[in-house]
């Protein structure tokens, strides 16, 4: 037989299919010019010493073969003895290691069999109603195709699926989308309506991430609040790796996951912007405010679930950094200014109440006054901190209030609102004899004592009603009892107590009269 012809003799090897897992597969045959044809195939397994034979059976039942040697591609003309206008059946037999391996057969009409390309170029992937939609430009002059896909996950073999007939300049396919694992897809095409035409090669892998991007395991911690009123947020994360199918390992465009940090400043709700999204690599400095932080994983289908972390406010308080003066027309706060042109956020909330009940006020950008102080004033009508109770006040500052990560804490302190001097007056003052010349004076704690750092001291005043002589005794804010000694029997005294803050003198309690009875000896 001539090498250019299909040889109508028995092939030079025994006729037996070994049924082994290796062997020839994916046989494709098509016309490549007006009178020339090509068949190509893949060979799975060791290639050393393998000889390939392209077998062909005509509709008459006569069969022939082409010897291809070690090649997996073979060309022949319409004069090679193979009928190109009628249906023929083709397959490959590979002779290796004293055994024959056979490919699946293809039955087609060679003249009408056009070489179809797989989807070429960019395959767009999107999500549509819980499924995967792939879309691509139809290869030139190949409108009208049947399309198949195959897909696999890291732990499952290839599964075949059908995209259905296509008849347009763009082709598309709906495929299954996995929730939690990455998939590799490949697509192939063949001529529509051409009986038994060959499938194209499989396309390059299309790597598709899971619908839910993997959520990293993270840990947050914050450093101590620095002198500048800021604290660094630090992150420890578990290295997470998305397991990829074989064809997606290495460079797998499409399966990338991006991690971002979403920061929500809970304190100072009256500021313009409360939320900011940052790249995970750059950990921000935060003020002493309360924050919620979430790590958001996103892939090409959008964000996944996130785990939210709550960072409580730093409650370290400054004892006397804040000065408050109450006048007839309102109240003014003074504190050491941070810098030129700073916006301040003053936040206050009644102590012991839920953080959600905080109120705040934003100042216009202000420069320090001549004494280097910043101020905030409000009228009595505004009702701000007007109730006679303890408030927790925090002042934040920023030169760029629109930038969430540039706020710093100026100070945190406690303040007793309303008419503190009257509200703080101690009640239930009682006098008990202690000895022949002394008494013990007790009183109920002032309301100011509920406000850490506000009550500076108690003052107990004792007045001798005969001589009108007055003595005053300072008492520690933690004490509610004092012993008055050096008193004379039979003399009437009055005692009063007041509670003082660092900037306000308290109102005296109601005078309490007492005397030490004269002891008559037998």
């Amino acid at each position: 037989c001539r090498t250019s012809e299909c040889c109508f003799q028995d092939p030079p090897y025994p006729d037996a299919d070994s049924g082994s897992a290796s062997g020839p597969r994916d046989l494709r045959c098509y016309r490549i010019s007006s009178d020339r044809y090509e068949c190509s195939w893949q060979y799975e397994g060791p290639t050393a010493g393998v000889s390939h034979f392209l077998r062909c059976c005509l509709s008459s039942g006569r069969c022939c073969y082409f010897a291809a040697g070690s090649a997996t591609r073979l060309q022949f003309s319409d004069q090679a003895g193979v009928s190109v206008l009628y249906t023929v059946t083709l397959w490959v037999e590979s002779w290796a290691r004293n055994q024959t391996e056979k490919s699946p057969e293809v039955t087609l009409q060679l003249y009408n069999s056009v070489k179809y390309e797989p989807p070429l170029g960019d395959i767009k992937v999107s999500k549509l109603a819980g499924q995967l939609r792939m879309e691509w430009e139809t290869p030139d002059n190949q409108v009208g195709a049947e399309v198949q896909f195959r897909h696999r996950t890291p732990s499952s073999p290839w599964k075949l699926g059908d995209c259905g007939p296509q008849d347009d300049d763009t082709e598309s396919c709906l495929c299954p989308l996995e929730m939690n694992v990455a998939q590799e897809f490949q697509l192939r095409r063949r001529q529509l309506g051409s009986q038994g035409s060959s499938w194209s090669k499989w396309s390059s892998p299309v790597c598709v991430p899971p619908e839910n991007p993997p959520q990293p395991q993270v840990r947050f911690s914050v450093e101590q609040l620095g002198q500048d009123g800021r604290r660094r947020l630090t992150l420890k994360e578990q290295p997470t790796q998305l397991e990829l199918p074989e064809g997606c390992q290495g460079l797998a465009p499409g399966t990338e996951v991006t991690y971002r940090l979403q920061l929500h400043m809970l304190s100072c709700p009256c500021k313009a912007k409360a939320t900011r999204t940052l790249h995970l690599g750059k950990m921000p400095y935060l003020s002493g405010a309360a924050y919620n932080v979430a790590v958001i994983s996103s892939n090409q289908f959008g964000p996944g679930l996130n785990q939210t972390w709550h960072i409580p406010a730093d409650t370290h308080t400054e004892p006397v950094a804040l000065n408050i003066s109450v006048g007839t027309n309102g109240t003014t706060m003074y504190w050491p200014a941070r810098a030129q042109s700073m916006t301040y956020c003053i936040e206050w909330q009644p102590v012991g109440q839920d953080g959600g009940l905080a109120t705040c006020s934003l100042t216009a950008p202000q420069d320090p006054d001549p004494a280097g102080m910043a101020t905030y004033s409000w009228s009595r009508e505004s009702g701000a901190m007007g109730q006679e109770k303890c408030y927790y006040i925090t002042i934040f500052a920023s030169a760029h209030p629109e930038k969430l990560t540039l706020w710093s804490t100026v100070l945190s302190t406690y303040h007793f609102g309303g008419n503190a001097s009257a509200a703080g007056t101690p009640h239930h003052v009682s006098v008990k004899n202690h000895s022949l010349d002394s008494v013990s004076v007790d009183w109920a704690p002032s309301l100011l004592s509920t406000c850490p750092g506000v009550l500076k001291e108690y003052v107990v005043r004792c007045r001798d009603e005969d001589s009108k002589q007055v003595s005053e005794h300072p008492v520690q804010p933690t004490e509610t009892q004092v012993t008055l000694s050096g008193l004379r029997a039979g003399v009437a005294y009055t005692v009063q107590v007041r509670a003082d803050t660092a900037w306000l003198r308290g109102v005296w309690s109601q005078p309490q009269r007492f005397s030490i009875e004269v002891q008559v000896s037998d």
Epitope: S155, V181, P214, P216, Q217, F220, P312
Partner: antibody, heavy 117, light 107 residues
């Protein structure tokens, strides 16, 4: 020695709150995260949330969001877990557990919380 | 969330025998972030294995862990009377989930 000591058993009515404590000793309190895990009678283990004792930073499992609060007191090296709006399904043994390197290397003995009307 | 399924639910063996407990994850457990715990009645769980195969401090070498991806195994080479308990696997690669447990009982 290194240990986590939990508060005693509690009986609560539906709708009430319970606060369980976990006192740590034998190691630096602020160096290890503490988790809370619960186990209903005859059931498996369910993760509730985590607290960083250093800054009080917390994160809770989705199903407990809004009902659980974890706090700490650095002066006594104690972590607290408060669960509100209790229902009968919350009857369980509540464990605190110390995190080693992401896994739980040390557990408290558990606190039985019974919710019954 | 990652669901862990342990099998068998109950395993009846005699002291001296070999026990093989299985834990299968609904999706791949990142970097073998899998631990095994032992729990005896009325006691807290105790860490046996972390990182799928590393033994915790003080755990006898008859306990060993293996596996990766979605399939993990705890093996007790020669059962001692004190080994009869409930065993839980736990993944800590994405939040935290536990298996439903395998009860190892004396035959």
């Amino acid at each position: 020695q290194v240990q986590l000591v939990q508060s005693g058993a509690e009986v609560k009515k539906p709708g009430a709150s319970v606060k369980v404590s976990c006192k740590t000793s034998g190691y630096t309190f602020t160096s290890y995260y503490i988790h809370w895990v619960r186990q209903a009678p005859g059931q498996g283990l369910e993760w509730m949330g985590i607290i960083n004792p250093s800054g009080g930073i917390t994160s809770y499992a989705q199903q407990f969001q809004g009902r659980v609060t974890m706090t700490r007191d650095t002066s006594t090296s104690t972590v607290y877990m408060e669960l509100s709006s209790l229902r009968s399904e919350d009857t369980a043994v509540y464990y605190c557990a110390r995190e080693g390197d992401w896994y739980f290397d040390l557990w408290g003995r558990g606190t039985l919380v019974t919710v019954s009307s | 969330e990652i669901v862990l399924t342990q099998s068998p639910g109950t395993l009846s063996l005699s002291p001296g025998e070999r026990a093989t407990l299985s834990c299968r994850a609904s999706q791949s457990v990142s970097s073998s972030y899998l631990a095994w715990y032992q729990q005896k009645p009325g006691q807290a769980p105790r860490l046996l294995i972390y990182g799928a195969s590393s033994r915790a401090t003080g755990i006898p070498d008859r306990f060993s862990g293996s596996g990766s991806g979605t399939d993990f195994t705890l093996t007790i080479s020669r059962l001692e009377p004190e080994d009869f308990a409930v065993y839980y696997c736990q993944q800590y690669g994405s939040s935290y989930t536990f298996g439903q447990g395998t009860k190892l009982e004396i035959k």
